[in-house]
């Protein structure tokens, strides 16, 4: 059956921790992605941003987990959930910002 949202969120947090722990080298060779609003539709927005990074094995599993959390199909070049596309940031910073927010959501019990 489908994975409970709380389980998927914990899995995503753990994976983001895995790829950032003690890491100083630029993630994905310093690739830049669109910054997102960490609000409603965050998982789809995050996926739409990260899916445009190719050839970076470090984030493959993150992309897979986000696929499971986003209710609609996402493909490269699609930006329906990325309401604001005005700032690009490094993947490492994107991941850290996302991780901070996800941990806040988890502590507050907001799993959806």
């Amino acid at each position: 059956g489908p994975v409970p949202p709380s389980t998927a969120l914990r899995e995503l947090i753990e994976e983001l921790v895995n790829i950032t722990q003690n890491q100083k080298a630029p993630l994905c060779n310093g690739s830049m992605v669109w910054s997102i609003n960490l609000t409603a539709g965050m998982y789809c927005a995050a996926l739409e941003s990260l899916i445009n990074v190719s050839g970076c094995s470090a984030i493959y599993r993150t992309q897979r987990i986000l696929h499971g959390l986003c209710p609609h199909k996402v493909s490269a070049g699609q930006f329906s959930s990325l309401h604001v596309r005005d700032t690009k940031i490094e993947v490492a910073q994107f991941v850290k910002d996302l991780l901070l927010h996800l941990k806040k959501l988890f502590r507050e019990g907001q799993f959806n």
């Epitope: 895995n18 950032t20 722990q21 890491q23 100083k24």
Partner: antibody, heavy 126, light 109 residues
Framework: EVQLVESGGGLVKPGGSLRLSCAAS????????MSWVRQAPGKGLEWVGR??????????NYAAPVKGRFTISRDDSKNTLYLQMNSLKTEDTAVYYC?????????????????WGQGTTVTVSS | SYELTQPPSVSVSPGQTARITCSGD??????AYWYQQKSGQAPVLVIY???KRPSGIPERFSGSSSGTMATLTISGAQVEDEADYYC???????????FGGGTKLTVLG
């Protein structure tokens, strides 16, 4: 005051078991990644293992020499870290320190904090 | 298993600059941390994430990293800096911690 206090050390025979405790106070223990580090007499520091905070998956990693014999656990409700040591060998004789883990010190939880206990002595001898 | 290599000993006169190196294959991508341990005491963090100094640590302590080498520098070493210094980092997975063998710093008083 931020503090870690280890207890449970002592003299044990080879093949025996011992359980060390580390009581934490003065910080949000549940957010912290915690490590055990040991130091044999006259030797250097040796990383034993680490447990992540539950929100970060609670993953536990061990150094090769202790894997399968030692078990790290935590009780966040008691602000306590544990090290269960089984099948002890003479080479496990050391001062055992618990410490907050710098590698986990990211994302606003307890950034930059570094705390060590004063250590508890474990002697494995027949 | 992953190793960090340090010189066993470094000696300087008071006021001189002491440099302690630490080499490891994963250091280009993983941060180094430096601990000071005085006799009979628990270790104290003096540098974290290669270059950052915790509050309360004197400014004469600094860290740098280039390629597979991390370096702890004590500018104007003082007698009270005499101690064992250990570098610490993780393997390339980030999952396993490792300490260098330690360097005994002697400040020739």
């Amino acid at each position: 005051e931020v503090q870690l206090v280890e207890s449970g050390g002592g003299l044990v025979k080879p093949g025996g078991s011992l359980r060390l405790s580390c009581a934490a106070s003065g910080f949000t223990f549940s957010n912290a990644w915690m490590s055990w580090v040991r130091q044999a007499p006259g030797k250097g520091l040796e990383w034993v293992g680490r447990i992540r905070s539950k929100i970060d998956g609670g993953t536990i990693n061990y150094a090769a020499p202790v894997k399968g014999r030692f078990t790290i656990s935590r009780d966040d409700s008691k602000n306590t870290l544990y090290l269960q040591m089984n099948s002890l060998k003479t080479e496990d004789t050391a001062v055992y320190y618990c410490a907050t883990d710098q590698v986990g010190a990211y994302y606003g939880d307890y950034y930059g904090m570094d705390v060590w206990g004063q250590g508890t002595t474990v002697t494995v001898s027949s | 298993s992953y190793e960090l290599t340090q010189p066993p000993s470094v000696s300087v006169s008071p006021g001189q600059t002491a440099r302690i190196t630490c080499s490891g294959d994963a250091l280009p991508e993983k941060y180094a941390y430096w601990y000071q341990q005085k006799s009979g005491q628990a270790p104290v963090l003096v540098i974290y994430e290669d270059t950052k100094r915790p509050s309360g640590i004197p400014e004469r302590f600094s860290g740098s990293s280039s390629g597979t080498m991390a370096t702890l520098t004590i500018s104007g070493a003082q007698v009270e800096d005499e101690a064992d210094y250990y570098c610490y980092s993780t393997d390339s997975s980030g999952n396993h911690g490792v300490f260098g063998g330690g360097t005994k710093l002697t400040v020739l008083g």
